[in-house]
């Protein structure tokens, strides 16, 4: 049965969704406002954002007394969303106050702003590394879901109707479907990854969904108002059940499993794709792009960053 990893503002926790006695285990405690969370399964690493400390932090699972390390501690204001590219070994995040979407290495180095225009309240972010695409929600004045290449290319709005507060976002990697939860319109919908063939999954019976994840045939989501984690069938919305209740303040949630992070080979593995700094996955050939930290230019060879990086 799936292990659910979730942020709970003051801590990050784990719960076995199929356990007989549903009790959560604390992964890391003593936090201010843990909001977004993700992981790198192969290394047992857990990453989270803290919107009060204005930081992205990291620790390791299954390591007694594992230290908490700072990954990014400057230039953040409200990092609402976080996603780990387990293939390209990068972190992507949204910041609803700086109105940016950024990427960096897993240790926070070679940080690059991918998007800084036409963002209002960017929140959830999800990755499909196999196809080189990233997806994010924006619950601002013009609410929408967008997608772009993980290298910042080919940005496109894919959902902008019947949408108000799109909070949760997750990808069904096997079936190539996008799921999202709308906290204002009280639904969970799904669609193809280009936004087409939209379908209702759950409607009208949600209070304030915040984050959404998936395992097998089951969707899991957190709800601010009920302070709980819920589940249902990903196709029908049936088999609704409450997984865990009476939480402090459940925020982002992920299914902690190898299945959620299937491995495959990319050009970025071989000598970093020949890139001096960032090797970012891309949806178009050669399926990767060399990139430089913000403020540093790429040389004409398309691989090396100019001095100063």
């Amino acid at each position: 049965s799936p292990l659910l990893l979730f942020a709970n503002r003051r801590d990050v926790r784990l719960v076995d969704a199929g356990g007989v006695k549903l009790e959560s285990t604390i992964v890391v405690s003593g936090l201010e406002d843990a909001a977004a969370v993700d992981f790198q399964f192969s290394k047992g690493a857990v990453y989270w954002t803290d919107v009060s400390e204005e930081a992205i932090k990291q620790t390791y699972l299954n390591q007694t007394g594992a230290a908490v390390q700072n990954v990014v501690i400057s230039g953040l204001v409200s990092p609402d969303g976080l996603a780990c590219d387990w293939v390209g070994k990068k972190l992507y995040w949204t910041d609803s106050e700086t109105n940016r979407i950024e990427v960096a290495n897993l240790n926070g180095t070679s940080r690059k702003v991918l998007f800084w225009q036409d963002l209002d309240q960017p929140r959830a972010i999800a990755l499909d590394p196999a196809h080189g695409y990233m997806y994010w929600t924006d619950w601002g004045e013009t609410p929408r879901i967008e997608r772009a290449g993980m290298d910042g290319s080919t940005r496109k709005i894919i959902v902008d109707s019947d949408i108000y507060w799109p909070n949760g976002l997750t990808i069904d990697l096997e079936e190539q479907k996008l799921y999202w939860a709308d906290a204002k319109l009280s639904f969970i919908h799904r669609a193809n990854l280009d936004g087409s063939f939209r379908q209702k999954v759950v409607e009208g019976s949600l209070t304030h969904p915040f984050a959404l994840t998936l395992s097998g045939d089951t969707l899991y989501w957190t709800d601010w108002q009920t302070r709980s984690i819920h589940a249902c069938n990903k196709r029908t919305g049936g088999k609704r059940k409450e997984i865990l209740s009476a939480l402090y303040s459940p925020m982002d949630i992920q299914v902690l499993s190898q299945e959620r992070q299937p491995f495959f080979h990319t050009r970025c593995e071989e000598d970093n794709g020949g890139c001096s700094h960032l090797c970012l996955l891309s949806p178009s050939e050669p399926f990767y792009t060399c990139a430089c930290p913000t403020g540093v230019q790429l040389q004409d060879n398309g691989r090396t960053c100019k001095a100063g990086a």
Epitope: E32, D33, S52, S78, E97, W139, H208, S249, M251
Partner: nanobody, 129 residues
Framework: AVQLVESGGGLVQPGGSLRLSCAAS????????MGWFRQAPGKEREFVAA????????YYADSVKGRFTISRDNSKNTVYLQMNSLRPEDTAVYYC??????????????????????WGQGTLVTVSS
């Protein structure tokens, strides 16, 4: 300089009422979400209530829902906290706070004391017989 000045605190018997006021100056009041927080002796500062810029939406901690009411008068640059059916556990220093970034109940940091930009000095409320 920005100033938030709370008033209206005092000693009240259990079941009684008080109305706290917070007068703001040095900021464009109508652009700020306003919050009330409280801190009891030996405890962490906790969220009590907040009201968004227009006054159209209000939010409360579970412990005060149905008893406390937050309101604002943008023409007077003042936010109020009407406290009814007071209990001994409501005893605390009450602080007024201003946050320009608040955007209603979908905003992650509405309830977080760590992100309010400006704070008053506080007013003491004691509920005791």
């Amino acid at each position: 300089a920005v100033q938030l000045v709370e008033s209206g605190g005092g000693l009240v018997q259990p079941g009684g009422s008080l109305r706290l006021s917070c007068a703001a100056s040095g900021l464009t009041f109508s652009r700020y979400t306003m919050g009330w927080f409280r801190q009891a002796p030996g405890k962490e500062r906790e969220f009590v209530a907040a009201i968004v810029r227009s006054g159209g939406s209000t939010y409360y901690a579970d412990s005060v829902k149905g008893r406390f009411t937050i309101s604002r008068d943008n023409s007077k640059n003042t936010v109020y906290l009407q406290m009814n059916s007071l209990r001994p556990e409501d005893t605390a220093v009450y602080y007024c706070a201003a946050d320009r970034r608040g955007r209603g109940e979908n905003y992650i940091l509405l309830y977080s004391s760590g992100r309010y930009e400006y704070w008053g000095q506080g007013t003491l409320v004691t509920v005791s017989s």
